[in-house]
């Protein structure tokens, strides 16, 4: 009597998420009598897949018809495959008793789940930087099979190589996630820019998933300040103006200072943006210059983004007045801790 | 090349729990089943238990009242818990990887850590 | 539970001779599958056990071929064809039919 055989051909198949697997299993012989089980995995802990006498198995139908005389083939179909169906399955013959005893085992197909990667998401530093600062930036993306990924940053469309990336876990798996951080050194510049984290991946088809951060949400461009003397009027009041330039966000407190003392208060809001994204504000202070007796010192102090707060400062002659309509006199910075702790002195 | 590492608390006081830790590295979690085994100083060695990947776990009834364990494949990592120590728990304890393609049974332990060892004293 | 039993408890042997270990368990380990669930662990000293027969007659992987499994239902045999000097250690024999896996109580190889 020839020794019974159960055939599994494939030692491995394939099958995208969403998409039904069909693992073939054939016997040798017709007897001994008794069923066919399938089970994914083997040993005690091993799950029941389908059992053509007894059970309900809605994913799972058999390729031919079981109970037609002769029938040698015991394949079957699992409908909408997903990552957790991978694994290995066996398909195993039973000889007829109470209860059924396994005679013999199929050698197993791997099932491997073929899932796309979700859509990248990428996170930026929780606080803003300067320019020439490097600032990093993250990317994840998950649940794809198998574990073959390339992952790619761009900003503006130039490729960015000072990255690092991990794909976990490290052996096989169900599913896999990549997460890859990027380091970007940033320019005044950049307040329009963008970095793409592109991920491509065998389920793709070629057409890569990106995910987008704008640097904007990184990057802090401090002001230059510069303080000037618009021109003396007739009636003995100087306008002063404080030009606050090239800054982003927009989020300035502009504070202006008579002699040390605190004459008003303004918040930057509305403004037109700079083609660079920056932004540009002037305010003016009208010093009666007749009121006072001794020399004015104006100081415009601004405060960028919560940052500590810079000063410039302007000192109205009051001892000799020009009558003439006199042309613009720039300020000087006084004060050895007034200077635009930014480079931003205009 | 498939690497298991135990880590835990190496004295545990008595009616304590003892919590150990196995990082599988290498490999997958994935189609094996995962056990411990513990060796009493210059004793034999016991099986404790273990966890397939579909989280099905098999106790040894001896120790079934007060062992838990427990799988992260997430993190490649599975866990063992065993309430209300005693002396009698000293031991060096083993993780270990269990194969299993052939029908019922398993098919050998073929990878294990290289053992952690646990002191029950107060 | 199924009870297994080594024996001899210890085994003196020369190097280059030859050397055989005996296992038996409390019901037989040949399942209707035709296998034997029956193991063969070596734990050299201040080591973890390492596997090197399974499912009775199997050599696993990187074992020498001196080292051999014989054996079905309830006797099994453990053979060394040529002992060599890295071969001392306790040698276990294990059950993997049925939980609880159960190991014999062990057999210590030593040279005379």
């Known amino acids: 009597e020839e020794e019974l055989q159960v055939i599994q051909p494939e030692k491995s198949v394939s099958v995208a998420a969403g998409d039904s697997a069909t693992l073939n299993c054939t016997v040798s012989s017709l007897i001994p009598v008794g069923p066919i089980q399938w089970f994914r995995g083997a040993g005690p802990g091993r799950e029941l897949i389908y059992n053509l006498k007894e059970g309900h198995f809605p994913r799972v139908t058999p390729v031919s018809d079981p109970t037609k005389r002769n029938n040698m083939d015991f394949s079957i179909r699992i409908s909408n495959i997903t990552p957790a169906d991978a694994g290995t399955y066996y398909c195993v013959k039973f000889r007829k008793g109470s209860p059924d005893v396994e005679l013999k085992s199929g050698a197993g197909t791997e099932l491997s789940v073929r899932a796309k990667p979700s859509a990248p998401v990428v996170s930026g530093p929780a606080v803003r930087a300067t320019a020439e600062h490097t600032v990093s930036f993250t990317c994840e993306s998950h649940g794809f099979s198998p574990r073959d990924i390339t992952l790619k940053w761009f900003k503006n469309g130039n490729e960015l190589s000072d990255f690092q990336t991990n794909v976990d876990p490290a052996g096989k798996s169900v599913s896999y996630s990549i997460r890859s951080t990027a380091r970007v050194v940033l320019t005044r510049r950049d307040v329009h820019s963008q970095v793409i984290c592109e991920v491509a991946h065998v389920t793709l088809q070629g057409d890569p998933l990106r995910g987008t951060a704008n640097l904007s949400e990184a990057i802090r461009v401090p002001p230059f300040l510069e303080v000037t003397q618009q021109s003396m009027r007739a009636d003995n009041q100087v306008n002063v103006t404080c030009q606050v330039t090239k800054f982003y966000p927009q989020r300035l407190q502009l504070t202006w200072l008579e002699n040390g003392n605190v004459s008003r208060t303004e918040m930057a809001s509305a403004l037109p943006e700079n083609k660079d994204g920056t932004y540009n504000w002037t305010s003016w202070l009208l010093v009666n210059v007749s009121a006072h007796r001794d020399d004015v010192k104006l100081t415009c102090q601004v405060e960028h983004d919560g940052q500590p707060a810079v000063n410039k400062s302007f000192s109205v002659k009051v001892s000799a007045h020009p009558k003439e309509q006199g042309s613009n006199t720039a300020a000087e910075n006084t004060g050895t801790n007034e200077r635009n702790i930014y480079g931003g002195s205009g | 090349q498939v690497q298991l590492q135990e880590s835990g608390p190496g004295l545990v006081r008595p009616s304590e729990t003892l919590s150990l830790t196995c990082t599988v590295s290498g490999g997958s979690i994935r189609n094996y089943y995962w056990s411990w085994i513990r060796q009493p100083p210059g004793k034999g060695l016991e099986w404790m238990g273990f966890i397939y990947d579909n989280g099905r776990t098999f106790y040894n009834p001896s120790l079934k009242s007060r062992v838990t364990i427990s799988l992260d494949m997430s993190m490649n990592q599975f866990s063992l818990k065993m309430t209300s120590v005693t002396a009698a728990d000293t031991a060096v304890y083993y993780c270990?990887?269990?194969?299993?393609?052939?029908?019922?049974?398993?098919?050998?332990?073929?990878?294990w850590g290289q053992g952690t060892t646990v002191t029950v004293s107060s | 539970d199924i009870v297994m039993t080594q024996s001899p408890l210890s085994l003196p042997v020369t190097p280059g001779e030859p050397a055989s270990i005996s296992c038996k368990s409390s019901?037989?380990?040949?399942?209707?599958?035709?296998?034997?669930?029956l193991d063969w662990y070596l734990q050299r000293p201040g080591q973890s056990p390492q596997l090197l027969i399974y499912l009775g007659s199997n050599r696993a992987s990187g074992v020498p071929d001196r080292f051999s499994g014989s054996g079905s239902g309830t006797d099994f045999t453990l053979k060394i064809s040529r002992v060599e000097a890295e071969d001392v250690g306790v040698y276990y024999c294990m059950q993997a039919l049925q939980t609880p896996l159960t190991f014999g109580g062990g057999t210590k190889v030593e040279i005379k």
């Open positions: 270990a990887r269990v194969r299993a393609y052939s029908g019922i049974g398993l098919d050998g332990t073929d990878v």
């Open positions: 019901q037989s380990l040949l399942y209707s599958n035709a296998y034997n669930y």
